[in-house]
């Protein structure tokens, strides 16, 4: 018996990310006796819920239970039954639900009430469903990537966990792109901030962090596209919209009522002489880029420096991890390599957008046409947002690292959210390391 390792005391946690376009369930695990250590929590499963985001269920709330079933059943299988009752479940809803709440608190409440009732039926320790703030979304994303990169650890390592991990303890900034919002979060060089709304103070593992964060609601890739369409149709002479952000030969009919459904297009709303219009792609990156830039108001800034729309942005500092849709889109376009310069990315985008739609469909036969058709816009939008929106340059581009996973865990706000709610990030550095679970007796 002397060589037998003690059975691991493992804990689990579940976080559902109720995004604007879809919901994902994440299962995390960690050794119980190490829960205050940095870097011990890791993701064991991601389950993508089939269907759109929960905000789209406002007209069919009775279907929410079925919608969540598959992934919740998957969690039941993955987590040992003996652990079910002590496994916390959290659901955080992001910008899609913020937009629904903006239109109607009642409808947002109704969706969340049904979600809560559905999740309460499972044998886990359900901790509630809520709409998280944009500030939280940014902050938890920043905590996640720095936790996974080992930036909060006081032990300096002679090795690197991931290729872009530097040995210093300088934190990475976080760039998150969703369907309805985008977040930028980092530690600026200057501790003082001109905009208290964008300032966060953390004490983590015995160190103080003064963090800048902002969430741009309506500037996720899907809502940005709706904004662009609403802006461009204003000046269309008829119900044909010749759009440089779609491939040549691409055609799609859009209902005006769908266009004006979101609060994001409110500023462009006007009475049009038609109920529908047709997008006709012309595939021109440069023109698409110009059209996208019109979504960013850079003419007004009440601070020393702004991102866009009068929002304070301090000078960029250090390396940044760009995740979620930043990664998904750039990965599809094969542009995530550290070796690809900003100029090269622009060149590749020009080439991609100009490719005929029929050719694109043939080349990417396995990809859903709805998603496939929007990569030209999304790639262009990402470049515009990073360069003109956040003021990255050709030189500072190399400080952006497009990250999908870090050590097997998805980059995103969910891990940071769970770490915070389970009190697994201590303010002070733990004094002594408990015995590891691999100790032999």
């Amino acid at each position: 018996t002397q060589n037998k390792a003690l059975p691991e005391n493992i804990k689990y946690g579940i976080v559902l990310d109720a995004g604007s376009s879809h919901t994902s369930l994440y299962i995390y695990k960690w050794p119980a006796e190490k829960e205050n250590d940095t870097g011990v929590v890791h993701q064991v499963e991601e389950c993508r819920v089939k269907g759109p985001g929960i905000s789209k269920y406002v007209q069919k709330v009775n279907e929410i239970g079925i919608y969540l079933t598959d992934c919740m059943e998957r969690a039941r299988e993955v987590i040992p039954r003996s652990q079910h009752q002590e496994t916390p479940v959290y659901l955080g809803a992001t910008a899609g639900m913020r937009l629904l709440r903006m239109e109607s608190e009642e409808l947002a409440d109704r969706v969340l009430d049904v979600v809560e009732r559905s999740l309460s039926n499972y044998p886990f320790d359900f901790q509630g469903a809520r709409i998280i703030t944009g500030q939280e979304e940014g902050a938890y994303g920043w905590i996640t990537i720095n936790y996974l990169l080992g930036k909060f650890s006081q032990k300096t390592r002679w090795f690197s966990i991931v290729p872009y991990e530097t040995n210093n303890q300088e934190t990475f900034g976080a760039l998150d792109l969703g369907g309805a919002s985008t977040q930028i979060t980092f530690v600026p060089q200057n501790q003082t901030t001109e905009s208290p709304d964008n300032a966060l103070q953390f004490r983590l593992y015995g160190k103080d962090y003064n963090v800048y964060t902002h969430s741009f609601l309506c500037y996720g890739k899907d809502q940005a596209l709706w904004q662009k369409l609403a802006k461009d149709i204003q000046v269309a002479s008829n119900e044909i919209l010749r759009d440089p952000c779609f491939h040549p030969g691409y055609k799609k009919v859009v209902n005006v009522s769908d266009l004006y459904k979101t609060p994001c297009t409110k500023r462009f709303e006007m009475t049009l002489p038609f109920q529908q219009f047709e997008i006709q792609g012309i595939g021109n990156y440069q023109q698409c880029h110009q059209s996208v830039l019109e979504l960013f108001n850079t003419s007004y800034c009440p601070y020393s420096q702004c991102a866009f729309n009068g929002i304070f942005l301090p000078p960029l500092q250090g390396d940044f991890g760009a995740f979620s849709a930043f990664y998904f889109v750039m990965n599809f376009l094969n542009l995530t390599s550290e070796k690809v310069s900003q100029e090269k990315v622009t060149e590749m985008m020009k080439k991609f957008c100009s490719q005929p739609w029929e050719e694109i469909k043939t080349s990417y036969a396995g990809v859903k046409e709805k998603y496939l058709s929007e990569y030209c816009f999304s790639g262009t939008y990402i470049l515009s947002l990073l360069l003109q929106g956040y003021h990255f340059t050709a030189d500072s581009w190399e400080h952006i690292h497009f990250i999908g996973k870090i050590q097997g865990s998805d980059a995103g706000w969910t891990l940071g959210y769970m770490l915070n709610l389970t009190n697994m990030i201590p303010a002070e550095q733990p004094l002594s390391t408990p015995l590891s679970h691999s100790t032999y007796v």
């Epitope: 903006m102 239109e103 608190e105 944009g134 994001c264 709303e269």
Partner: antibody, heavy 115, light 111 residues
């Protein structure tokens, strides 16, 4: 806690304009719409319109269309309601109220007297 | 426009007794299974205070004696046991459709 603080009382001549401000605190200003409601002496409450602070888009009660302008300064978390071509029947208390469809938070009101 | 008609215009009730106010909408204010119906209390010199939202949900910090019921076009606000501090004007409101509209108000007094 959520607070909406409005500017002080105004006395205006007929034909003039008035601009009332509403400073918000205790929440993310761009996450909620801001409505304007007025109440003439002894009258029912009357909804005037709202603005989406996020982007400045607005919707008005047709009764006031062309006379009312609602704007925001997001950096100051402040909404403004301007009513032009004032007449005596515009004498009322003007309120701002936060909400999508639920007016849970109201400013203290601004009395505008037209005489 | 949706017209909101409140009844009665005024109501005198003894302390501790039940007060009932009705509101009728000229068309249904229900949508997606939710009633976009609200009740407000307004005291002299004060802004309205939200009592009930979604026809039957109590606003934050509202005493349990206030309750709302109804759906579609007919709604009721009930004060189960009238207190001295409940003397006020009560308004109903719909936000199903623009322009959002209010009822004419019901003045509640103590008998």
């Amino acid at each position: 806690q959520v607070q909406l603080v409005q500017s002080g009382a105004e006395v205006k001549k007929p034909g003039a304009s008035v601009k009332v401000s509403c400073k918000a605190s205790g929440y993310t200003f761009t996450d909620y719409n801001m409505h304007w409601v007025r109440q003439a002496p002894g009258q029912r409450l009357e909804w005037m319109g709202y603005i989406v602070p996020l982007n400045g888009g607005s919707t008005f009660n047709q009764k006031f269309k062309g006379r009312v302008t609602i704007t925001v300064d997001t950096s100051a978390s402040t909404a403004y309601m301007e009513l032009s071509s004032l007449r005596s029947e515009d004498t009322a208390v003007y309120y701002c109220a936060r909400g999508g469809t639920r007016f849970a938070y109201w400013g203290q009101g601004t009395l505008v007297t037209v005489s | 426009d949706i017209v909101m008609t409140q009844s009665p215009d005024s109501l005198a009730v003894s302390l501790g007794e039940r007060a009932t106010i009705n509101c009728r909408a000229s068309e249904s204010v229900d949508n997606f299974g939710v009633s976009f119906m609200y009740w407000f209390q307004q005291k002299p010199g004060q802004p309205p205070k939200l009592l009930i939202y979604g026809a039957s949900n109590q606003g934050s910090g509202v005493p349990d004696r206030f309750s709302g019921s109804g759906s579609g076009t007919d709604f009721t606000l009930t004060i189960s046991s009238l207190q001295a501090e409940d003397v006020a004007v009560y308004y109903c409101q719909q936000t199903k459709e623009v322009p959002y509209t209010f009822g004419g108000g019901t003045k509640v007094e103590i008998k």
